[in-house]
Interface confidence: low
């Protein structure tokens, strides 16, 4: 079955700057600002557009080793980024894949809202643990906060 999970996270960073850093340059920036979570992101095929495959290696102390993601859509004009987790111990034995649709929208006061809509594709009739879905959201939030902190400390970058 398919289990949906939606989350919204407020950010003080304007949408365009956040998309440019967190999404478009995330492969380089995230391991730099959150080394305690992600140790490396390696592009193993593609130019960053749809079809690109990335290997993400988690840091020591994180209960997962690696994840393989496929880029499904990149919409620079509307700050949309869709990708699918297709491999990795994060999926366990009950999940076939997890598809994420990320959209960053402008918010009052100059900030933005990061909206994530996730579809957890379970194998057969397996249920998806709510904790697993919540855990994915919390990890994404940690990475977002780290990127925000970096952007505030380095005001000249990603403008």
């Amino acid at each position: 079955g398919v289990f949906n999970y939606e989350a919204e996270t407020p950010s003080v960073i304007p949408a365009a700057r956040l998309f440019k850093s967190y999404v478009l340059d995330g492969d380089k920036l995230i391991p730099k600002v959150a080394p305690q979570v992600i140790s490396s992101v390696e592009n193993v095929g593609g130019n960053g557009g749809p079809g690109t495959i990335k290997n993400i290696t988690f840091a020591e102390g994180i209960p997962f080793k690696f994840v393989k993601e496929r880029v499904d859509e990149v919409d620079n004009a509307n700050f949309k980024y869709n990708y699918t987790v297709i491999e990795g111990d994060v999926l366990g034995d009950k999940l076939e894949k997890v598809s994420h649709e990320l959209k960053i929208v402008a918010a009052p006061g100059g900030g933005s809202i990061v909206k994530i809509s996730s579809k957890f594709h379970a194998k057969g009739y397996h249920e998806v643990n709510a904790e697993k879905m919540k855990g994915a959201k919390e990890m994404a939030e940690k990475l977002l906060r780290a990127v925000e902190s970096y952007l505030l400390a380095h005001t000249a970058e990603y403008n």
């Epitope: 407020p10 305690q36 006061g109 900030g111 906060r145 902190s149 505030l152 400390a153």
Partner: antibody, heavy 125, light 112 residues
């Protein structure tokens, strides 16, 4: 693991000085404002001071102005609090905390989200 | 300085039952960006404080969803939908709109 570890506390006579240190691990403290918060024995929490990422902006509670100085060494991932002219009412556990506050942006605030275990300062003759 | 006032001072609770703590500020904590700069912290016995809620209603990472924050302006509330034994400790509200940041006096939550 993201953590903060304080040190430098101890027993000091009134009028004396101490330098408290706070070392961050698991994250780059240079990306964050940092705060000191204290708690007198059996009392509530009192925010003491905070410092901007690059050290250019510092804030203090009125009762410590002119006696306490906050500073940081980003290369060492460390935060400091120099406390001079100590008084009995400065006796407390001193906590450092990661402070996601930024007065310059106005909007950026996500709470004091990581705290150390605290270091105890006792002022007594 | 902004003065924060919490009530009650002490709150005896029964596990499984709801609980509510109020916090009032001496001036509005509503920023022009529409966010209320009000946090809730829990200090468990013998431990450092931990962040529960920031900007009035946003749960911090890892905080169980039985905790919720609400309110705007000068009146704020922390609710625990079903109290668990591990929730005992002292709860503090804190304003972060202006320095000096200021805390409420605390509410001690204990099991009946």
């Amino acid at each position: 693991e993201v953590q903060l570890v304080e040190s430098g506390g101890g027993l000091v006579q009134p009028g004396g000085s101490l330098r408290l240190s706070c070392t961050a691990s698991g994250f780059m403290s240079s990306m964050y404002w940092m705060s000191w918060v204290r708690q007198a024995p059996g009392k509530g929490l009192e925010w003491v001071s905070n410092i901007k990422q690059d050290g250019t902006e510092k804030n203090y509670v009125e009762s410590v102005k002119g006696r306490f100085t906050i500073s940081r060494d980003n290369a060492k991932n460390s935060l400091y609090l120099q406390i001079n002219s100590l008084r009995g009412e400065d006796t407390a556990v001193y906590y450092c905390a990661r402070d996601l506050y930024s007065s310059s942006s106005g909007y950026y605030y996500y709470g004091l989200d990581v705290w150390g275990q605290g270091t105890t300062v006792t002022v007594s003759s | 300085d902004i003065v924060m006032t919490q009530s009650p001072l002490s709150l005896p609770v029964t596990p499984g039952e709801p609980a509510s703590i109020s916090c009032r500020s001496s001036q509005s904590l509503l920023h022009s960006n529409k966010y209320n700069y009000l946090d809730w912290y829990l200090q468990k016995p013998g431990q450092s404080p931990q962040l529960l809620i920031y900007l009035s209603s946003n749960r911090a990472s890892g905080v169980p969803d039985r905790f919720s924050g609400s309110g705007s302006g000068t009146e704020f509330t922390l609710k625990i939908s079903r109290v668990e034994a591990e929730d005992v400790g002292i709860y503090y509200c804190m304003q972060a709109l202006h320095t000096p940041l200021t805390f409420g006096g605390g509410t001690k939550v204990e099991i009946k």
